[in-house]
């Protein structure tokens, strides 16, 4: 399955939108900084078969979509930017789902991939827990926005590596 060029453009658009969504200066949030321990090894396309990498990407985008689809998220961000951002993520999910169906038929996804998906889920659990502990404060959301920008950048890089493998 070849991810369309529009997919990587969508990822870039999502990054730009997320960059524009900031409503508070990060420089006023230095006390709220947090280490979410992003599972970097899950974004290393070299150790994965293509089907595994695509399912990890799918999980990453799905969890991001879920995070920004909550009521608390709606209250935190400017509505039109949030809607555009969610639309970009939804389109990426559709692209990836088509690929997941195609690729899993080609190669069986080993148990190792379940560990990778679990690592991504735990990462998002840490993010959600942080927001709860910080009572969804503006600075907590700003810290999470910065973190998701980084994870989306990692996703973009993994997609680039996948295209180079094709």
């Amino acid at each position: 399955c070849d991810l369309p060029q529009t997919h990587s453009l969508g990822n870039r658009r999502a990054l730009i939108l997320l960059g524009q969504m900031g409503r508070i200066s990060p420089f006023s949030c230095l006390k709220d900084r947090h280490d979410f321990r992003i599972p970097q090894e899950e974004f290393d396309g070299n150790q994965f078969q293509k089907a595994q990498a695509i399912s990890v990407l799918h999980e990453m985008i799905q969890q991001t979509f879920n995070l920004f689809s909550t009521e608390d998220s709606s209250a935190a961000w400017e509505q039109s930017l949030l809607e555009k951002f969610s639309t970009e993520l939804y389109q990426q999910l559709n692209d990836l789902e088509a690929c997941v169906i195609q690729e899993v038929g080609v190669e069986e996804t080993p148990l190792m991939n379940e560990d990778s998906i679990l690592a991504v889920r735990k990462y998002f659990q840490r993010i959600t827990l942080y927001l709860i502990e910080r009572k969804y404060s503006p600075c907590a959301w700003e810290v999470v926005r910065a973190e998701i920008m980084r994870s989306l950048s990692f996703s973009t890089n993994l997609q680039k590596r996948l295209r180079r493998k094709d």
Epitope: L15, Q20, S25, P26, K31, R33, V144, M149
Partner: antibody, heavy 123, light 112 residues
Framework: EVQLQQSGGDLVKPGGSLKLSCAAS????????MSWVRQTPDKRLDWVSI????????YYPDSVKGRFTISRDNAKNTLYLQMSSLKSEDTAMYYC????????????????WGQGTSVTVSS | DIVMTQAAFSNPVTLGTSASISCRSS???????????LYWYLQKPGQSPQLLIY???NLASGVPDRFSSSGSGIDFTLRISRVEAEDVGAYYC?????????FGSGTKLEIK
């Protein structure tokens, strides 16, 4: 390959103005925060200003606040430093620097630096 | 502002032996998130500064593992296990815990 190409340094009289530029290439400029750091004649490094990736937020130390303005044009992949009301103590080599992707831990490590541009404030 | 203090010169070292450079901050750089926001930069003669160490003990990309760093939150040490001629230059510590970000005055590594 990440590159930061600087220009705009000059000899200027006290009270004068100057605009420095830093042209970026080899990376997605719009995804990274940027800073200006200066090196005084006694070789001390002095952080001057910072701007977020989208350009919405900036910060300055008291020594330059109200006199210096950091800005960026993401369409042109260029960072700027507008300096006005210059003083002799602003004489330095000015470097632009890219901030590493810090995520939620806001790691402002400066992982790439320009070659520097010299500013001399003297009558 | 957080003040970073460094000695102007290191003890002269022989090539192939180890060297240590110290830095002290006026306040603990250990954040409540567990990260110590202490950085080391090297400026080789005639060059721009380059990142060596981030978050107190992590090696920046492309930095040889001869370099290591440790500290307590206030006192920090950069170690070079086997000094090479290319390691000559000024070593700066810096903090990113609080704004304004501040640098030490730099320590010049001297070779015997």
């Amino acid at each position: 390959e990440v590159q930061l190409q600087q220009s705009g340094g000059d000899l200027v009289k006290p009270g004068g103005s100057l605009k420095l530029s830093c042209a970026a290439s080899g990376f997605t400029f719009s995804s990274y925060g940027m800073s200006w750091v200066r090196q005084t004649p006694d070789k001390r490094l002095d952080w001057v200003s910072i701007i977020t990736s989208g350009g919405s937020y900036t910060y300055y130390p008291d020594s330059v606040k109200g006199r210096f303005t950091i800005s960026r044009d993401n369409a042109k992949n260029t960072l700027y430093l507008q300096m006005s009301s210059l003083k002799s103590e602003d004489t330095a080599m000015y470097y632009c620097a890219r901030h590493a992707e810090g995520g939620g831990n806001y790691d402002y490590a400066m992982d790439y630096w320009g070659q520097g541009t010299s500013v001399t404030v003297s009558s | 502002d957080i003040v970073m203090t460094q000695a102007a010169f290191s003890n002269p070292v022989t090539l192939g032996t180890s060297a240590s450079i110290s830095c002290r901050s006026s306040k603990s750089l250990l954040h409540s998130n567990g990260i110590t926001y202490l950085y080391w930069y090297l400026q080789k003669p005639g060059q721009s500064p380059q990142l060596l160490i981030y978050q107190m003990s992590n090696l920046a990309s492309g930095v040889p593992d001869r370099f290591s760093s440790s500290g307590s939150g206030i006192d920090f040490t950069l170690r070079i296990s086997r000094v090479e001629a290319e390691d000559v230059g000024a070593y700066y510590c810096a903090q990113n815990l609080e704004l304004p970000f501040t640098f030490g005055s730099g320590t010049k590594l001297e070779i015997k």
